[in-house]
Each structure stands twice: as C-alpha cells, then as structure tokens.
Interface confidence: low
C-alpha cells in the first residue's frame, strides 16, 4: 500500500526548499525573565496571537511576579510587547486567558491583586487584544470567566466566597445573582445551570446539593433537582448523578429539556468511591464510562440510545484510573464513527482498541505492514499496533504528544505506539494512518512533537530530545517522504510547537529557549511554507476516496451508521496548497437497514455473536427499576431501537410484537410524591 | 567575567542603617533576580530576600520585613540592600548573589533550581556601641 | 517556612575516602535544591544545582541525589582542597532556606 517512510533518501527532494524556507522562517526574541510561557489565539484566520510570559517566586509572605504581554498579528512571525495595554500588572497564570467565543475579539485576563482588595481586577478586550480596559470586580473570582457559547457579553463566574457573580455586559458591570453555589455551566440558550448546598458547603452536602436553573440571567429560578451529586453537560443531553434514597449509591438521571423532566439512565449504579464519566457526546448519544467497583483502574463503556436513556454494554475493561484520572479514550475527528482507547487485562497489560461504528464493536489495531512483534509479542508474527495516549504521558513514557487527527485532514491520524501484544514500555515511534485507523505505517523513528498543517497537505515534526534542537522535519505526501530543514544555527531547548487551531494554516512556529551559561531567553521560529505549496490546489489535484472501505465488492461496503461517505481527497503526489478556505468535499450516500443498524431497547440485550435482540430473561414478569421523564406511563418496545445518528432507510425492518413494559418509578428525584407512584403488575 | 562586587565593610551604632552596595558585570543586569543572604560569626547561611531588576520589585523574608529594603540602579547596574534598626545580632557578612529563583524548565509545568550561581565577595557589617 | 537539616553536623574523613552528606526537608521541595561550598574567610560555592546536576567547572567526584524530602551529596574521594563546610539550600517556597551545614575536616 505504501513503502516505509523515508527522509531525504528515496524520496523526491523538493526543488530549493532550503532557500523557500530560510526565506520564510521569522525568528522572535523575548527579552524577559519569564518561567513559563502561555500562548492563545485570539479569533480564526486573524493571525493574532497573545503570549503571556510569567515570573513568579513563590514565596510564602509575598508572592511577587511579574507578566509580559506580547501581540502578533501575523500568525507569530513578529511579536509586539504590549504589556504596558495592562498597567504593566501581573496576571494571574491559574486563570490563563479567557478567549470569547467564535471570532467576538474577546479577551479577559485575570490579573493579581493584593490581599487586602475588596475583589479582582481584570483586563478586557473586545478588538482582539489591540486595547484593555481594566476593570475592578466586586469579588474575587475563583474561576476564570466563563462566556456564554451564544452571546460573548454574557459572562459567569464564581467567587472565593462561592458567590455566582453574571455580567450581561462583557465584564462592565457584575451582579451576584446566588449565594452558596458549587458548579455552575452555561447550557443552551443563555440558560445557566448550577449546584448549590444548603447546609455546611460544597464538599460536606455532595450528595445533598441542588441542582438549579435559571434562563433569564438570575432574575427567576427554577430548582430542577435534589440530592446532586454531581452533574455535566453532554451534547443535547442533562445528566446529574443522583444519591439514592437506601444507601450511599447514586444513578444517572438523564434530561433533554433542561432539567424540566427527567429519566433514569437504565445504568449501573455507582457507591462512594466509583465515578460516572461522559467520555463523549454529541447531538445523537454519549459515551459514558461506569467505575468498576475497587480500585481496578477500569470500568466499563456503555453507548446510549438517542433519548440517552437506555444504554447498550460497548466495552469491558476500560482503562480509567480515578477520578479526574487519565483514560485514553479519542475521538478520532478525522474519520466519523471512529474512536481508540485502552483496556486492562488481566494480566494488567494495556492494549489499545478501535471502534469504527461509534462503539459498536471494539477490535485492535491491525498490525503496521513491514513492522515487526516487539518483546511484549507471544507470536512474533501476529500482533498490533498499540498507541500511546494520556496514560502513558501520565506514566512518564517517552511519548511526548497525544493523538492527533483533525476534522479537515480526512482518514489522516498521527500517534506514537508500538507492535506487539500490549503496549511497550520502550522508546515508542510514530505511525500514521490515512484511512482513519483501518491499517497503519511507521511515520518516524523514536518519539517526536507533530502538527498537521493546510488540511494535511503538510505534516511537521520535531524529535523529542533532551538536547538543544535546530532541525523540523516536513511532509507533503502524509508522512511518507520526509525533508529536513535547519532553522535555527542556535539550537535550542524547544518547549512546544505552536499553529492555529484547525490546521488550516501554513505557518508553525517553534518555540523554545537558549542558555548561555545560565541566563534562559525565549525564543520562536515563525516558517511559512506556503513557498514550498506554491501553487493552489486543482481539481486534478484531488481523487475520491471511499471512507470505511474494507471489501469494494459488497454492497454495503463503507456502510457505517447507515451511510456511506465518499470524499475527495488530496493526492499524495501533490504539492499544492489546499488553502485557508478548503472544505472537506464528501458525498454521502443511503444504505439499507439492517440488524446492525438497531440496538437493543429496554429490556433487550444481544447475546455474544448474535445479531437478534431477545428479551432479559431476569426480568420477565418483574417490575422494572426503570424511570421515563419521571412519572409513570406504559412503555411500550418491539424490542429494537434504531442507533442514534444512523441514517439507513429500507431494507430490514425488525417487526415483532410491540410488548407492554409496566414497571414501577423508583426515582424520587424532582418531585418526592408524584415519583414515588408505582404501579402494581 | 561575571561578577558581583560589594562595597566595603562598615561599622554602625544600634539603631543606625547600614547601605550595602552590589554592582554586576559580566552579564545582562536585568536577565536576573539578586538574593541577599547573610552569615553571622561562626554561623550558617540566612536568606534575606530577593529584588527583580526589571521591575524593582521585591520579596523578604519574614524576619527582616520592615526593616531591609531593596532597591537597584539599573543605569549603573548595582543593587543595594538596606537594613534600618541595627542591632547587635544583625553582626554579619552579608552576601550578594545572582538567583534564578525557580525559573521554569521545559514548560509551564515543571519548576527547576538553578542555584545561586555568582556571589559577590561579602561584606562585613559590625554593630557594636 | 520549609525547615532544612543537615547531617551530620561533623563529619571527620580521610582523604581519598568516600564522604555522604545528607539534608532533609520538613516538607517536599521536588528538585529545587542546591549545595554549595564554603571555605574559611571566602564567598559560599555553587556545586550542585536542581538537586543532581553539577554546576560548571565543578569535579565528577561532587555528586547530588534525591527528590521530595531527602537529599544526598557525595564526594567520592576525598581531595585536600574539599574540607569546607557544605550547606544545602531549598527553592521550592519562599523563603529560601539553607540547612545549618556540614563541616567536612580531615580526620
């Protein structure tokens, strides 16, 4: 399918590449003192960015530092010091900066006050950082400032004092609109959800919080639950862990209208040392992890329905150490339907696992072509890739980035890994797919730093060293062919490679500093290589691609939820720019239902290697622990229910007896009285 | 070379200010922090407190706040250390040194020490009456 | 503030021979700690930096160990020119604080 990577040999050497980049490589020296060094982008496609470097000595008594505040407008190439835009004060690190929503232009920086002061101080920016207003809040806050996704002027944040402070105008003007709260999130439409406790505090009434809602910005409440333990936001859907009423043990309760009615999610319940996690969600389902009882470091992945009710059993042995903790579980943005993670075997292994029908079924990770078993392998010819996630960056492996696909980079996903039975606790390489994890290839020997750039018309490396660096590896054919550029005489101890979010840009930039002797100074190198990719992308310059293929001669070949996408595609030999305003071309197409396309309803389950679903034989002719929108009513079920977000029309209709489902509503979540009712059977 | 050289010892009556003086070469003044540390006779090594060249701002320690102030001349690339309120125990040599003071290795994340790297030669203060 | 001890106070060595100095914290310092050197009538001496590396111009013998609380210098053999007294000096919270020392003399 494709031949081992290269780099500069056996591969085509793109004509003056040295003289195109020298050209275009923008060096910035940042004269300052600073210890670390935060980056944001400010809007998309402005080019602007806004680094903060800080200085802090943590001393007990007085904690004294200072902030530099530089502005580029030119994707990095050349930086402004505009720290005199915030009085010269020292901001607030914990805080970092609070980017608006969207292209607003909105900044906020929190910046350091002195312990005395009747609350904060910020710095506003709705121009994209050209001008700040500083102004002095009325609070301390806790968190950083939180916009509203539909409207940048709203803002929430929470104080010291645990105060739910809302701004209607970005910032200006702040108005406490509740007292005692614990979490609070913006939802849809300007509503504001939030917890607050009613006795001693947020840590000694988990379990006995409430859960609030308002949706006109503080002015009325609706309480919308008791006895929280916690709640999220995932997608369209609500969710609230609720404690039960016998024991210590709590259950996810599930709303798709704000909180107005609930169900309980037909979930595991967990107990105090267990934790629920939405791994994933989107308008259709969510993933959601449930904690194995102990202190297993796993769990399981259950996928929802499109009510988020009814939960089908998708993997054992998750990976997921704690709460809070690592798991590896990725989205895998480039290919729909696709997602990697990591199981715990018995043998306390870690291997890695893919889905490519939205958890469906998990299989591993087939084996890169040309690449051999490694140590953890019984059989030296059969084995597979396994990938390197946040749990081995949490271990310490050499492994210095996570995944990596993007949306506009179609079936292209990057990550460090090894061959074998599990994965390895070796140096890992790099391998990449270009079908969206269907099959793999070695892309760099060893661990190294990537970005995709211009849609993955360009891939860029960095090895990972402990020594100062001075060269970046680039790639125009998806990581076949590799050139290697010096762009820097100096090398430096790099921290980072920097590009505005989307890889739709052309420009990297490398960041890093020199020592002399023991004095740092921070640096980055800007290349452009829009010179190397001179010329726009043609029509000729793209093939179509069918996604999910892995058998051209069935019917249903690239079927994945009912549909088939065919995308076009850059071919590899092509240098040419996709450009800032390239949009992934893709034409999808209906496929027939079948059995595949339905997961089991309420009271249903598959058994192993059977594609008919049947009923749960503990429970016929038993009351049923379940609760609809919280109130009791006939549930009625053929037994199918159609995966959320599938699309296939005709073909197999599973038809059988729609069965009455009585069952009692054990959930006294809203309304004590009326979810208590029962109803005998 | 980089050094740091103090001025030269000093006598003071209880209650009197002594000013000690710290001039760097060798390098860029402002790329470091200076810590001032002192040593009484026969005894070990105290940290007094620690001034940002670029900004002039400052951080003692607990024991000497109120009484030491740090200043710096960026033009002659000197820092001063002044201690008000003398009294017989502040008996002393008292160091200069040039500090990174935590300065952050790869990254936000991870906090590296570099130590004190230069120090100036001392310079001894006597209190006595 | 973060307390530093070090032992032994004295230490008697002869030399060629091996010398272990310890220092402990009252409290985690991660790496952020350095020793230094300290001869009669002179200026304190950077040795050891970030808790294991050795500053420039300082000899393979002067080695630096541990993180957290409990902190090692050794010395692997012994030159005339290394009795002195040695302090270590955390930089993990302020104020920085230096242990009380070890005096290194010949035995």
């Known amino acids: 399918r494709r031949g081992a990577p290269a780099e500069d040999q056996d591969c085509g050497r793109l004509p003056d590449f040295i003289a195109k980049l020298t050209n275009n490589t923008h060096q910035h020296v940042f004269d300052d003192l600073s210890g670390s060094v935060s980056l944001s982008w400010v809007g998309d496609s402005t080019g602007v960015i806004l680094v903060l470097t800080t200085f802090q000595v943590p001393l007990v008594i007085v904690s004294f530092g200072q902030s530099k505040l530089y502005r580029s407008e030119d994707y990095g190439k050349n930086f402004k010091d505009i720290t005199n835009l915030i009085n010269n004060t020292f901001i607030r690190t914990e805080f970092g900066m609070a980017i608006g929503p969207e292209n607003s232009g909105k900044v906020i920086l929190t910046a350091e006050v002195s312990g005395g002061s009747r609350g904060g101080r910020v710095f506003r920016s709705s121009d994209f950082a050209k001008n700040f207003v500083q102004t002095d809040l009325p609070f301390h806050p806790l968190t950083q400032m939180m916009y509203s996704p539909q409207n940048s002027d709203y803002l929430l944040a929470l104080s010291t004092e645990n105060g739910l402070w809302v701004s209607k105008n970005f910032g200006e003007k702040w108005e406490e609109i509740h007292k005692a709260v614990c979490l609070a999130k913006w939802g849809p439409n300007n509503i504001i959800f939030f917890t607050t406790h009613v006795n001693g505090s947020c840590k000694a009434d988990l379990g006995a919080l409430e859960l609030w809602r308002t949706s006109d910005l503080g002015k009325t409440f609706k309480t919308i639950g008791v006895k929280i333990y916690s709640f999220g936001l995932g997608g369209r859907f609500l969710f609230a862990s609720v404690m039960a009423d016998k024991d210590t043990t709590r259950r996810i309760h599930v709303s798709t209208d704000q909180g107005d009615t609930w169900s309980m999610a037909q979930l595991p319940s967990v107990g105090q040392e267990q934790f629920y996690s939405i791994l994933a969600a989107n308008e259709d389902m969510v993933f959601m992890h449930v904690d194995e009882p102990g202190d297993t470091g796993f769990g399981t992945i259950f996928t929802s329905d499109d009510r988020g009710i009814v939960y089908s059993k998708s993997l054992d042995r998750h990976l997921y150490t704690t709460t809070g903790g690592e798991t590896d579980f990725t989205n895998v943005t480039s290919l729909r339907g696709v997602y990697i993670t990591s199981t715990l075997s018995e043998d306390n292994s870690i291997q890695s696992m893919i889905t490519f029908d939205q958890g469906g079924r998990w299989e591993h990770l087939r084996k890169p072509e040309n690449s051999k078993c490694d140590a953890t392998a019984k059989n030296k010819n059969e084995c597979s890739l396994h990938i390197h996630a946040s749990y081995s960056i949490s271990q310490k492996l050499n492994v210095p980035m996570a995944p990596l696909s993007e949306p506009n980079a179609v079936g292209i996903v990057i990550a460090h890994g090894s061959v074998g039975d599990a994965i390895s606790v070796m140096v890992p390489d790099v391998y990449i797919s270009d079908d969206g994890g269907y099959s793999w290839a070695k892309m760099l020997e060893g661990p190294h730093y990537y970005t995709i750039l211009d849609s993955g018309g360009i891939i860029v490396a960095i090895e990972h060293s402990n020594r100062p660096i001075n060269v970046i590896k680039f790639s125009t054919d998806e990581g076949q062919c590799w050139q290697s550029y010096v762009f820097t005489q100096e090398p430096i101890y790099f921290t980072g490679l920097a590009s505005e979010p989307g890889a739709r840009s052309m420009n990297i930039s490398i960041w890093g500093f020199t020592e002399s002797f023991i004095t740092r100074q921070w640096v980055s190198y800007t290349v452009d290589f829009k010179d190397i990719l001179e010329r726009n992308c043609e029509e000729d310059d793209y093939t179509t691609w069918l996604a999910h293929s892995t058998d051209p001669g069935d019917y249903k070949d690239g079927c994945i939820l009912g549909y088939k996408e065919q995308f076009l595609r850059l071919r590899k030999s092509s240098v040419c720019q996709n450009g800032r305003d390239y949009v992934v071309a893709k034409q999808p197409s209906v496929c027939p239902c079948s059995l595949e396309d339905f997961l089991c309803d309420f009271g249903y389950f598959r058994p192993e290697n059977a594609s008919e679903c049947v009923e749960q034989p503990e429970l016929k002719g038993h009351e049923l622990e379940f609760c609809l929108y919280g109130k009791e009513e006939h549930l009625t079920t053929n037994g199918y229910r159609k995966i959320p977000g599938d699309k296939c029309q005709g073909g197999m209709n599973p038809a059988r007896e729609v069965k009455d489902l009585k069952k009692k509503c054990t959930s006294n979540f809203l309304n004590p009285t009326k979810q208590n009712s029962k109803s005998n059977s | 070379q980089v050094q740091l050289v103090q001025s030269g010892a000093e006598v003071k009556k209880p209650g009197a200010s002594v000013k000690v003086s710290c001039k760097a070469s060798?390098?860029?003044?402002?790329?470091?922090?200076m810590s001032w540390v002192r040593q009484a006779p026969g005894q070990g090594l105290e940290w007094m407190g620690i001034?940002?060249?670029?900004?002039?701002?400052?951080s003692y320690a607990q024991k000497f706040q109120g009484r030491v102030t740090m200043t710096r001349d960026t033009s002659t690339s000197t820092v001063y250390m002044e201690l008000s309120s003398l009294r017989s125990e502040d008996t002393a040599v008292y160091y200069c040194?040039?500090?990174?003071?935590?300065?952050?290795?790869?990254?936000?994340?991870?906090?590296?020490?570099?130590?004190?790297?230069?120090w100036g030669q001392g310079t001894t203060v006597t209190v006595s009456s | 503030e973060i307390v530093m001890t070090q032992s032994p106070a004295t230490l008697s060595v002869s030399p060629g021979e091996r010398a272990t100095l310890s220092c402990r914290a009252s409290?985690?310092?991660?790496?952020?700690l350095a020793w230094y050197q300290q001869k009669p009538g002179q200026a304190p001496r950077l040795l050891i930096y970030?808790?294991?590396t050795r500053a420039t111009g300082i000899p393979a013998r002067f080695s630096g160990s541990g993180s957290g609380t409990e902190f090692t210098l050794t010395i692997s053999s012994l030159q005339s020119e290394d009795f002195a007294v040695y302090y270590c000096?955390?930089?993990?919270?302020?104020?920085?604080?230096f242990g009380g020392g070890t005096k290194v003399e010949i035995k």
């Open positions: 040194a040039r500090d990174p003071s935590g300065i952050a290795a790869a990254g936000p994340a991870s906090r590296y020490y570099y130590g004190m790297d230069v």
């Open positions: 060798g390098y860029t003044f402002t790329s470091r922090y």
């Open positions: 001034i940002n060249p670029v900004g002039g701002s400052t």
């Open positions: 409290q985690s310092v991660s790496s952020n």
């Open positions: 970030g808790a294991s």
């Open positions: 000096q955390q930089a993990r919270l302020g104020p920085w604080t």
